[in-house]
Interface confidence: low
């Protein structure tokens, strides 16, 4: 398997997609695991629903979610609030019994905050205090943030 690189920004969500042959892997649950060393084991992070027919339901383990489009043949993993320690080698797997087939090897790269040129206490840009003002938000409904989570881009 070639390794596919997915780049994400610190504090941002990263979506990893793993395409597969839906017929070949029909009825199989999927998993996302982290490679421990070049030749070490792949440590399970999260797997799809125990009932294969419910694989489309998103399952979370901490800040990592998995969902499977079993008809379209695409496994999607979401890494929320990406952090530098999330960088590394991962695998998308198809499970059958105690065995696991590798669907895709993934290298996750975490890029630094692109707006990190602000000094401590500064706002986003040197002129931000003059350029920004209160904005009207229409019927704003959004997911709640985890305590301490800083969505991208963070404020200083």
């Amino acid at each position: 398997h070639n390794t596919t690189v997915f780049q994400g920004v610190a504090g941002q969500s990263l979506q990893v997609s793993c395409p597969y042959d839906s017929m070949k892997h029909w009825g199989r649950r999927k998993a996302w695991c982290r490679q421990l060393g070049e030749k070490g084991p792949c440590q399970r992070v999260v797997s799809t629903h125990n009932l294969w027919l419910l694989s489309f339901l998103r399952r979370w383990n901490g800040s990592t979610a998995i969902t499977d489009d079993t008809l379209g043949g695409t496994l999607t993993i979401t890494l929320r609030n990406l952090q530098p320690h999330d960088a590394g080698l991962y695998q998308c797997q198809s499970l059958h019994g105690s065995e696991a087939d590798t669907l895709r090897k993934v290298l996750v790269e975490v890029l630094a905050d692109p707006l990190d040129h602000r000094d401590a206490g500064d706002l986003w840009f040197p002129g931000e205090s003059e350029s920004f003002e209160d904005a009207h938000v229409e019927h704003s409904i959004s997911r709640s943030l985890l305590e301490g989570e800083i969505p991208f881009p963070p404020t200083s």
Epitope: P114, D116, P126, D134, A135
Partner: antibody
Amino acid sequence: EVQLVESGGGLVQPGGSLRLSCAASGFTFTDFYMSWVRQAPGKGLEWVSVIRNKANAYTAGYNPSVKGRFTISRDNSKNTLYLQMNSLRAEDTAVYYCARLTYGFDYWGQGTLVTVSS
Amino acid sequence: DIVMTQSPDSLAVSLGERATINCQSSKSLLHSNGKTYLNWYQQKPGQPPKLLIYWMSTRASGVPDRFSGSGSGTDFTLTISSLQAEDVAVYYCQQFLEFPFTFGQGTKVEIK
């Protein structure tokens, strides 16, 4: 897959108003700064406005050329970005692009044409 | 506002040859953290712009390695090492250091 689809452009008379929309999909909308960039026919690019993310209270910033006339907003329940344009002038004639803002404008819509003419 | 000036306005290069576009800013875009806040975009006819390079020299995801960015605090260069037919486009530089964001006027690259 990240997708941005603008709508709402058209022909309007000087002094008139128009509201542009941008439907976003394929990413966590509330996490990102969103922006409008415009391009007059046969001309270059001009940044118009930006609205920050949830963590930054969705505050907005404007190019001085449109400040006081244009208002950027977002409806996070609909994953939609808006640009309310009032007191339109002939020089506002352009294709208006919605763009996501990270290291730069990393994803763009196809644009919607606004023509200000009598 | 920071003024961005590109040269030349247009450029005709043979297939497989090197294309070089210059951009100058009226203020240094080099920050004390060592990063230079200069972006390059490619816009093909009838399409929206596409981010090519950020931080002056970092290629955006999926951009071929024939595209490279270099420069100093105020003088920047986008180089296409071996021009391909699909590279015919207008290229824009943009400063990302402060408000308002400003773009260069664009450089049109054509096949000779």
